[in-house]
């Protein structure tokens, strides 16, 4: 894992969109995809296990000194934990990649609490990229202005 | 060093109008989640106001939810509450709180002010 | 809304002893729960963040420890500096809330 982090806490729960879509992983030829679509009601939703660590701040980089902290994620289905969203900055998408060790850097995700129900994923290494929705897809996205709707994710605790 | 200082308390008449200020430094303030927090005399400790890191998002709880307004000048580095319609029962020391870390209400408050009274009397 | 309920109301130690403040949660949560301690006339300081994680400078005679509804604060060797009050805290869910508070003197 990251250099200086320390893992906080795990939780699972599900992961919907801004637009109430479901995120799930499905298995296709031996390997998981991530799906983003409308799932019914009464549909069982798929699960993510969230790792929370706390990273300090660098104060060249924060201008807080010591004080600044982040709160960072990593994410794995709760159906594999060994498996992580891994932000791909060469095609701008997210992936399910398989880990021997510890997540690499691509793996955690600063987050943002936007409003008290919706979070958004900021690439630790991409700063100003977020995960997205795109085409019914997870991708790398950035954001353009604070109000953007698809970065906005819902956690919800089963 | 991080500081949160408040000004504005002082004693009001029922009916009447306050703003609170928080002025903070030692730290980058339009990266916080910024809470006001009071506490009435000799009781605990309540939650009236949140506003996010951006500034976009406001909450608030049912018991001065239309009647308080949480706002922020980032270039000013101040935090404020505009309190209307008071009661004799918002009589308390309201603190300015900073959250724990970047962008997040998790973890807390681990900075409070020094707190301003804040009398509703007639 | 989550209610914080906190307990006891008031406690008396003696100068290392061991004290235990207890919280239950109305409905379980995540480990979003707080410590704070309030001396006389002052601000409240965070002891305690996410349940059970130290803030810094803060002395490790003080632990968290609980998690789902149930939270608790330990002092492991009361010291005269002690004496204060303490509350709970959750910011798991709108509205946030506190624990009513526990006084804590000394003997």
């Known amino acids: 894992s990251i250099q200086g982090t320390s893992l906080l806490t795990q939780s699972p729960a599900s992961l919907s969109t801004y637009n109430d879509q479901s995120v799930s992983f499905v298995l296709e030829n031996g390997c998981y995809v991530i799906n983003v679509d409308d799932s019914g009601k009464d549909q069982e939703q798929d699960q993510v296990l969230l790792r929370y660590y706390e990273s300090p701040c660098p104060a060249s980089q924060s201008g807080d000194g010591v004080d600044g902290k982040k709160l960072m994620v990593n994410m794995s289905p709760i159906k594999d934990t060994d498996i992580w969203l891994h932000a791909n900055d060469k095609d701008y998408s997210v992936e399910l990649q398989r880990g021997d060790v510890s997540p690499p850097e691509q793996a955690f995700f600063v987050l943002h609490k936007k409003s008290s129900d919706f979070v958004s994923f900021e690439c630790k290494n991409l700063p100003g990229t977020y995960i997205g929705v795109k085409d019914n897809q997870l991708a790398l996205v950035e954001e353009k202005d604070e109000s953007c709707n698809n970065i906005m994710f819902k956690l919800s605790k089963i | 060093e991080v500081q949160l200082v408040e000004s504005g308390g002082g004693l009001v008449q029922p009916g009447t109008s306050l703003k609170l200020s928080c002025l903070a430094s030692g730290f980058t303030f339009n990266n916080y989640w910024m809470t006001w927090i009071r506490q009435a005399p000799g009781k605990g400790l309540e939650w009236i106001a949140s506003i996010t890191y951006t500034g976009g998002g406001t909450y608030y709880p049912d018991s001065v939810k239309g009647r308080f307004t949480i706002s922020r000048d980032d270039a000013k580095s101040t935090l404020y509450l505009q309190m209307n319609s008071l009661r004799s029962e918002d009589t308390a020391t309201y603190y300015c709180t900073r959250a724990n870390y970047y962008y997040n209400t998790y973890g807390g408050f681990p900075y409070w002010g020094q707190g301003t009274l804040v009398t509703v009397s007639s | 809304d989550i209610q914080m309920t906190q307990s006891p109301a008031s406690l008396s130690a003696s100068l290392g002893e061991t004290v235990s403040i207890e919280c239950l949660a109305s409905e379980g949560f995540s480990n979003d729960l707080a410590w704070y301690q309030q001396k006389s006339g002052k601000s409240p300081q965070l002891l305690i963040y996410?349940?059970?994680r130290l803030q810094d400078g803060v002395p490790s005679r003080f632990s968290g420890s609980g998690s789902g509804t149930r939270f608790s604060l330990k002092i492991s060797g009361m010291q005269p500096e002690d004496e204060a009050d303490y509350f709970c805290?959750?910011?798991?869910?709108?509205?946030?809330?506190f624990g009513s508070g526990t006084k804590l003197e000394i003997k």
């Open positions: 805290q959750q910011g798991s869910k709108y509205p946030l809330t």
């Open positions: 996410a349940a059970s």
